[in-house]
Amino acid sequence: MPNSEPASLLELFNSIATQGELVRSLKAGNASKDEIDSAVKMLVSLKMSYKAAAGEDYKADCPPGNPAPTSNHGPDATEAEEDFVDPWTVQTSSAKGIDYDKLIVRFGSSKIDKELINRIERATGQRPHHFLRRGIFFSHRDMNQVLDAYENKKPFYLYTGRGPSSEAMHVGHLIPFIFTKWLQDVFNVPLVIQMTDDEKYLWKDLTLDQAYSYAVENAKDIIACGFDINKTFIFSDLDYMGMSSGFYKNVVKIQKHVTFNQVKGIFGFTDSDCIGKISFPAIQAAPSFSNSFPQIFRDRTDIQCLIPCAIDQDPYFRMTRDVAPRIGYPKPALLHSTFFPALQGAQTKMSASDPNSSIFLTDTAKQIKTKVNKHAFSGGRDTIEEHRQFGGNCDVDVSFMYLTFFLEDDDKLEQIRKDYTSGAMLTGELKKALIEVLQPLIAEHQARRKEVTDEIVKEFMTPRKLSFDFQ
């Protein structure tokens, strides 16, 4: 995803005014409670960000820098130290990482609770993925609707994506794909994967050819996750947009129904951003609608879409869900994952541009060992004596966090948690346990990737009919 500075105070102020206007228009148009609630929650989150940045409440019609009376009749904002999350920036001051319960409230999504996990288990007849059991996928929008459809033998499809900003992908990039592969397997449904090479061209200093070649290289890593070639279509925006009238028509429909004010409010665009950036959200939204893929779904517009993605992508799909009913399509459902922490700590997302912040899919066994031992933030004590006496802190220990992602055995993970917390297990031993999980995982991925030929990539990326069993 592109990187940008958090919006200036004035931009944030204008975003709030814009979002307030959106809320008003939804209310004046008697929109559904869900639409109004989610727009209001987005507004509240913007106001909280404003308070965190300005040190005072947002006041309607009183831009930053203008003196205003201190009292405010609106609802109280929470404390100033708010997490900041948008598609380009993820910031928190807490070593534990983002407060995801707060994020659910701010974004107006729903928590993936025991009840929903049990329902997924009943519907699929499969043990829920450890990403669900451990709260790595923690939030959703309308997943119950998807399960209703599935239980009534109605079709749905999966959509996820990747912004191919460099050839090197890190283990964090695998999270949505590992989970999406599981979803594809247990629900036996088609999947579309968008490679947003156009986005990367717009946001990064790349040529079009470079952006496209990154998309193809990244596609190899994605294919290596084990997706079913008969049920998966991977596409480059630069490639597919020109050959699919169904896709482009939806992009244009979305563009017509979303104002510049709205995208400014949602994404913090400024007047100096190029028009490509401003219209890009429509391109990421279009795959949410089934007739963007006529070769797969013909001209059907009623097939529900389920999008597994990291929570920072939610603003794109809030916009998508807002526009869907206005262009006659069902709203896509979403499953949100937590962020994969950087080796140095959970305060930020990992970055592919900082080699020591990440374990890359190209790393050797030796590099993995060195990076974990040298750079993985520890929740252990300063001395062995103290550690034995007081134990380590799993909440901030990156090695333990990584194990929650990659160690599938629940019993082993729980034993490690107990031993580390009690002080029976030292930091070096915890890091060793992680290295022993990561080294074979990466080696196996590299072996599978080697088997992905250009012909296989071409087949995955060719628009075609997929095999599935929809009425």
Epitope: V23, R24, A28, K59, A60, A68
Partner: antibody, heavy 121, light 110 residues
Framework: EVQLLESGGGLVQPGGSLRLSCAAS????????MSWVRQAPGKGLEWVSA????????YYADSVKGRFTISRDNSKNTLYLQMNSLRAEDTAVYYC??????????????WGQGTLVTVSS | QSVLTQPPSASGTPGQRVTISCTGS????????VYWYQQLPGTAPKLLIY???KRPSGVPDRFSGSKSGTSASLAISGLRSEDEADYYC???????????FGGGTKLTVL
């Protein structure tokens, strides 16, 4: 179609009580802040009270504080105004109004037809 | 005595442009949105302008609102006989924690 229908007005003696109701239809009542606004015969508009969509934030005009209570029942799509210790100066047509803004800003896009409250001995 | 001050009356002939002022303070108009309402004889008020200058759908573009500092104004161009009504400005007041209206302006179309 959005509709707001006030009821419960009438003649009451000074010091007496009345409960006004406003039945809402044609929109998702629970998503909107609501207000009561009154107008004494031949006079201007006077805002009386406001309540947030969920009922957690409530505001009153100084002239009615401690005597009037605003409430809502979202399951019944109804807004209420309990008026106690009524005075002659409370005589007015009472309107309920829907606030379409997002922060109780007084953006009243729909109004009821009003109900007359007369306080007289 | 209203918190927001409006002239009690205004008049104009058909086709003319008339302006109604609304004066407040830093705690109301100075830091909050201004709203304008039209009340035709014997009817409930109707929202005419919201957020200082925006028109709800259905309100003709002959009506326009503006705000500067602690004052606001409503302009009606191309005056028509059906515009004869009472006009009220309103705004939230932070120091009172209350919504305040102007005293109203009776517009007569001559």
């Amino acid at each position: 179609e959005v509709q707001l229908l006030e009821s419960g007005g009438g003649l009451v003696q000074p010091g007496g009580s009345l409960r006004l109701s406003c039945a809402a239809s044609g929109f998702t009542f629970s998503s909107y802040d609501m207000s009561w606004v009154r107008q004494a015969p031949g006079k201007g508009l006077e805002w009386v009270s406001a309540i947030s969509s969920g009922g957690s934030s409530i505001y009153y005009a100084d002239s009615v504080k401690g005597r009037f209570t605003i409430s809502r029942d979202n399951s019944k799509n109804t807004l209420y105004l309990q008026m106690n210790s009524l005075r002659a100066e409370d005589t007015a047509v009472y309107y309920c109004a829907r606030d379409v803004a997002w922060d109780m800003l007084g953006d009243f896009d729909y109004w009821g037809q009003g109900t007359l409250v007369t306080v007289s001995s | 005595q209203s918190v927001l001050t409006q002239p009690p009356s205004a008049s104009g002939t058909p086709g003319q442009r008339v302006t109604i002022s609304c004066t407040g303070s830093s705690s109301n108009i100075g830091s909050n949105y201004v709203y304008w309402y039209q009340q035709l004889p014997g009817t409930a008020p109707k929202l005419l302008i919201y957020a200082n200058s925006k028109r709800p759908s259905g309100v003709p573009d002959r009506f326009s609102g503006s705000k500067s500092g602690t004052s606001a104004s409503l302009a009606i161009s191309g005056l028509r006989s059906e515009d004869e009504a009472d006009y009220y400005c309103g705004a939230w007041d932070d120091s009172l924690s209350a919504y305040v209206f102007g005293g109203g302006t009776k517009l007569t179309v001559l």
